[in-house]
Structures are given as C-alpha cells and as structure tokens.
C-alpha cells in the first residue's frame, strides 16, 4: 500500500479542514485507511478521520477543527491498519480555501441596472469576514462566448450591473466565488448559479410588481 500523491489540505478557517490524496492503486478508503490529526499543542487530543472515496484511488477526509488561529499547526498521520503510510504537518492559516458565498440573488435596480447580492459566508467575528474579495462570473446561457468576469474588491457583497452591457432579451446566469488576499488563499468553490432574463427597454415593465405601488 503506497501513497502516490501525498495529502494536500485546505481549511475554511472556521470549522473544517479537508485533505485529499491519491493512492497508487484503487483503494476502499473508508475500509482501509485512517487519517489521524492532532493540534501540535500540549495536552491536545488525537482525532481520527475516516476518509471517503472521491475516485477509485483518490481519498478525501473532512476534519472538524476549532476556529483556527494563525499559530495552529496539526500533526497528520495516514495509517493503513498498523502501517504508517505518511506523516506530515498542516498549518490551516497557510492553506485557506474560503467557504462558498451564499444566497446569490439578482434584483432590478434604479437607472437600468441589475443589483447582484450575496452573503458573506463568515460571521462578523471571524478573521475572514472582512478579508474576502469576490469574483462574479456572468454568462449568456445561449452564447458561450458572451461572458463577463467582475472583480469585487470592495467590502460589500454586491455588484451593480448596467443592463445595457448585456444583450437584451437574453437569459443570463451569475455565480460568485471568494478569495482572501491576506491569507493568499485559493479561490472558494463557485456558488450555485442564479438566472435571470435581461430586458432593459422599457425598464419599468420589468420591475417586480410591488415596486409599482410606490408610484401611486
């Protein structure tokens, strides 16, 4: 039993670290392997993670961890029964993969714009809450060549989009992902897409009905 690609781990820096590795042959990860992890700190408990298969020889382990701090270092040991296959350390703050932004919605806004909004995946007290910047991908559902990428480097999880920059009458999808520059993180996974129809002439006809009541 041999490890082909040694474990690579990422932390969401709040509750979970995920390690992935590849064995040199197809392996029933949950039956044959265990990943033990222990905070490198006096009196810390040793924990065991039961890996799952992703592919026939790729194993993934999700480890619940406490709210991370920069000094945290975990000792990792990969076991096949009594045989130690690999040993290494993991510092969550150096391998951050942010959580996926949530609840992406699109709303008609004043001045012929669409307002895209989503939620920051971290509570305000977490280090990453104020560190995230975002990438928004907007694509035409029927034209793969028609797509735009927006970098949202300001704090608020919103993006204003001029309807005139998109084709009228076309269906568009948007998705968003996050990055923590200070931590030199990897990108988060993309959020689920949200889809809308882009009409901008005449704009008023395409506002949600409850907006019209304000004019009476």
């Amino acid at each position: 039993v041999k490890v082909l690609h040694e474990p690579s781990c990422f932390s969401d820096y709040i509750s979970t670290s995920v390690c992935q590795w590849k064995m040199d042959h197809p392996t029933n990860c949950s039956a044959e392997l265990r990943l033990s992890y222990q905070l490198d700190f006096m009196g810390s408990e040793n924990h065991t993670c039961v890996p799952e298969n992703r592919e026939d020889s790729v194993c993934v382990c999700s480890m619940p961890i406490d709210d991370a701090v920069e000094a945290d270092v975990y000792q990792l040991d990969l076991w096949a029964g009594q045989q130690l296959l690999w040993s290494g350390s993991f510092q969550p703050s150096k391998h951050v993969k942010p959580r996926t932004p949530g609840n992406l919605t699109v709303h008609p806004n004043i001045s012929h714009t669409w307002l895209l909004m989503w939620t920051n995946p971290y509570p305000t007290e977490n280090h990453l809450h104020s560190e995230l910047t975002y990438m928004v991908n907007v694509s035409n559902d029927n034209d793969p060549e028609d797509f735009k990428v927006y970098n949202v480097t300001y704090m608020g999880p919103t993006l204003r989009l001029a309807a005139s920059t998109l084709k009228s009458g076309a269906s568009y999808s948007a998705r968003v992902r996050a990055w923590a520059q200070t931590y030199n993180s990897t990108w988060s996974d993309w959020s689920p897409s949200t889809t809308w129809l882009n009409y901008y002439e005449p704009w008023e006809q395409h506002l949600p009905h409850h907006h019209h009541h304000h004019h009476h």
């Epitope: 082909l4 690609h5 690579s8 992935q20 197809p26 026939d56 990897t186 990108w187």
Partner: antibody
Framework: QVQLQQSGPELVKPGASVKLSCKAS????????IHWVKQRPGQGLEWIGW????????TYNEKFKAKATLTVDTSSTTAYMELHSLTSEDSAVYFC????????WGQGTTLTVSS | DIQMTQSSSYLSVSLGGRVTITCKAS??????LAWYQQKPGNAPRLLIS???SLETGVPSRFSGSGSGKDYTLSITSLQTEDAATYHC?????????FGGGTKVEIK
C-alpha cells in the same frame, strides 16, 4: 493488457440522441473509474465526467450535466455515454479513459451532428 | 473551475533542440498535473503524472517540473517522433480541466 474499445463513428440529426459505448478488457472492470472526454476538431480536451462501475456512482462536469448520461453494464464490462438534444456544437471526438490521470484511452468515437 | 493556460499554442523547434512548454493554473493544483502527447487521429498518451513522474516507457528526454500554479514540460534533444500536440491536465479539482494544447513542429 488493458484495452478500451469504443464504438464506431456516428452521424445523427440535430435534436436526436446517441449512445456511445466503451468496452473494457484486460483488467477488473469494477475496480476503476471510467471517464469521458470531448475533443472538438482542432481544439483542446474537455472533461465530461466519470462513472464508478462498481456502484454506478457518477460525477459530472456541470457544463455537461444536461447533455450527457453515463451508465455501465458490468456483465459486458461496457461503459456508455448517452448524449441528448444534439446540436452542431456536439460534433466532436469522444474518448473514454480509465482513472485519472488517464493512462489508458479508447481510440475515440467521432460524432457528427448534421441535418 | 480551474483554468489551465498553455501560453504557446504553437512552437517550431530544430531537430535535436530543446523545447519548454508552460502551463499555468488559475488556482493551486498541488502538483496534481499530467502531461499528454497527442498525434493527429490518435488518443492522447500520458507522459507525466504528479507534475514530475515519468510514465513507464516514456523516454527520459521528457521531464516535468513545477509546483503551486506553474508547471513545465521539457523535451531535450528533440526527435522527429516528438512532433505532436501536448496537453496539460489538472486532476486536483472537479471539474478536471485541460490546457488548450501546444503544437510542436520540427524545423
């Protein structure tokens, strides 16, 4: 020796469906994933998804979720990919391959979508 | 999705020369990178996996290097049979993705 033998070329009309096959031999079929890859003329490679023959579990590239359905028949050690609602964009060579990274490939099936 | 960018789509190199093909990932792929050689009408052939490990039967003039987001395939003392298209492939993150390919021609 490990072999992946794919079905022959297909010419189909827009809107139709087609089922491509990949017959595996020379190893225990249920042990390894089978992946499918698309290559349009003069273009790069696109990963469609994989199926794990032991339990039929699939993972798709989001882009192909509505386009492709992967299945296997363990009794004949054959993997299948059905492509739906075909358009000219689906005209390509489709390869099956065993387990990432892809050390074993089928010879490819050429699909032409034309009226 | 992780984008894989091969900076050159075409390279013309002298027989016996050296060629270097680069591949840049849009995010970390932790060395889960493979290189393939493909000749017209054929399926790709795996040359290198894990960024640096040469597959059995692949000549030693091929080598792979890199880490993080940046990877390189090198071919020294180029032979006529090395004329082909070379693809990089990340298999770290789903969906797996490929570079656009680099066609190597022998002068």
């Amino acid at each position: 020796q490990v072999q992946l033998q794919q079905s022959g070329p297909e010419l189909v009309k827009p809107g139709a469906s087609v089922k491509l096959s990949c017959k595996a031999s020379g190893y225990t079929f249920t042990t390894y994933d089978i992946h499918w890859v698309k290559q349009r003329p003069g273009q790069g490679l696109e990963w469609i998804g994989w199926i794990y023959p032991r339990d039929g579990r699939t993972t798709y590239n989001e882009k192909f979720k509505a386009k492709a359905t992967l299945t296997v028949d363990t009794s004949s050690t054959t993997a299948y990919m059905e492509l739906h609602s075909l358009t000219s964009e689906d005209s390509a060579v489709y390869f099956c391959a065993r387990s990432s990274p892809f050390g074993y490939w089928g010879q490819g099936t050429t699909l032409t979508v034309s009226s | 999705d992780i984008q894989m960018t091969q900076s050159s789509s075409y390279l013309s190199v002298s027989l016996g020369g050296r060629v270097t093909i680069t591949c840049k990932a849009s995010d970390h792929i932790n060395n889960w990178l493979a290189w393939y050689q493909q000749k017209p009408g054929n399926a790709p052939r795996l040359l290198i996996s894990g960024a640096t490990s040469l597959e059995t039967g692949v000549p030693s003039r091929f080598s792979g290097s890199g880490s993080g987001k940046d990877y390189t395939l090198s071919i020294t003392s180029l032979q006529t049979e090395d004329a082909a298209t070379y693809h990089c492939h990340q298999y770290w993150s789903i969906p797996y993705t490929f570079g656009g390919g680099t066609k190597v021609e022998i002068k």
